[in-house]
Interface confidence: low
């Protein structure tokens, strides 16, 4: 039933200074929600190009409502960067969310629809923490 | 994972800040990260992060939900974590007087083109 | 998991033809769509032609009224059939399984295709 048919919402989380400052490094969180049915492939992307290193998503989306038959899912993904890469406002972080909205084996043979397929991203850009030197700043752009 | 530090860290929303998650990370492999007991908080599973450029590996979960007193220093309360993981961020860095004493005492900064 | 392996892939002349096959295994009964992509070289993996389970057909610009796309389901075989082929056409063409169930996506090793007189 394609009025059953949800695409995600993307958000992207900045890491926190407690982190930075804590590990020197800096995890992004990316979070896809309400969508349905469960068929999304999530990617991150690094100053327009996708990347893998630093990266962890969930081995599969998660029901928002167990219960439900139809629940409607949700997906989260991390990237992990340096500091320093973080820090450098320069850097520019997406989070793209391929969803496909395939409905059931018998409804595709009754109908013949199309899939609902969308991509649906969100974004940040790396941030100083105000207070960086010369050398730490050099760093964020070496490393980009 | 070598050398665990367990840690939980609030993150937030790149686009509004009211919007929150919690990310437990950096802890070792024998921690199972449960469930939440409450329908309205979502809980991942472990996973495992590979920084290969830095020869770096971390286990990480993420907790989140839109209850108003939903809190990071006890979103993890149903695994079985070390005391004092939570790390609080300080509200911010960006401190006016620590950016013009920074830019006062780092001349080499001031002559950088920064555009 | 599903395993995909494509054929059927060679040099051949502009205005040839070419009948490229994919073979499917594994949990066939997952797959909602199947579909070839190609790559060119530099570029991004571009959509060709999709078909799902229940027969429906879609094609992108370019391979319209030249290309068509077919399965076998007796096989779990997918065939893309290109006619009129163009040296801009030469790529390395992917199988791809779209599946119901997460993971939902899977690809193939890829088969080059190279017009050229």
């Known amino acids: 039933d394609l009025n059953k048919v949800f695409p995600p919402e993307v958000a992207v989380f900045e890491p926190s200074e407690a982190e930075i400052s804590h590990t020197q490094k800096a995890t992004l969180v990316c979070l896809a929600t309400g969508f349905f049915p469960d068929h999304v492939e999530l990617s991150w992307w690094v100053n327009g190009k996708e990347v893998h290193s630093g990266v962890s998503t969930d081995p599969q989306p998660l029901k928002e409502q167990p219960a439900l038959n139809d629940s409607r899912y949700c997906l989260s993904s991390r990237l992990r960067v340096s500091a320093t890469f973080w820090q450098n406002p320069r850097n520019h972080f997406r989070c793209q969310v391929q969803f496909y909205g395939l409905s059931e084996n018998d409804e595709w043979t009754q109908d013949r629809a199309k899939p609902v397929t969308q991509i649906v991203s969100a974004e940040a850009w790396g941030r100083a923490d105000c207070g960086f030197t010369s050398v730490s700043y050099q760093q964020g752009v070496l490393s980009a | 994972i070598q050398n665990p530090d367990p840690a939980v860290y609030q993150l937030r929303d790149s686009k509004s800040s009211d919007k929150s998650v919690c990310l437990f990370t950096d802890f070792d492999s024998q921690t199972n990260v449960s469930q939440s007991k409450d329908s309205d908080v979502y809980i991942t599973d472990k996973t495992v992060l590979d920084m290969r450029s830095m020869d770096f590996k971390s286990n990480s979960a993420v907790a989140w939900s839109n209850k108003s007193d939903f809190a990071c220093a006890n979103a993890f309360n149903n695994s079985i974590i070390p005391e004092d993981t939570f790390f609080p961020s300080p509200e911010s860095s960006c401190d006016v007087k620590l950016v013009e004493k920074s830019f006062e005492t780092d001349t080499n900064l001031n002559f950088q083109n920064l555009s | 998991e599903v395993q995909l392996v494509e054929s059927g892939g060679g040099l051949v002349q502009p205005g040839g033809s070419l009948r490229l096959s994919c073979a499917a295994s594994?949990?066939?009964?997952?797959?909602?769509?199947l579909g070839w992509y190609r790559q060119c070289p530099g570029k991004e993996r571009d959509m060709v032609a999709t078909?799902?389970?229940?027969?429906?057909?879609d094609y992108a610009d370019s391979a319209k009224g030249r290309f068509t796309i077919s399965r076998d389901e007796a096989k779990n075989m997918v065939y893309l059939q290109m006619n009129s082929l163009k040296p801009e056409d030469t790529a390395v063409y992917f199988c791809?399984?779209?599946?119901?169930?997460?993971?939902?996506?899977?690809w193939g090793q890829g088969t080059l295709v190279t017009v050229s007189s």
């Open positions: 791809r399984a779209l599946s119901r169930l997460y993971p939902y996506n899977y």
């Open positions: 594994g949990e066939v009964h997952k797959i909602n769509i």
């Open positions: 078909i799902t389970i229940g027969d429906a057909t």
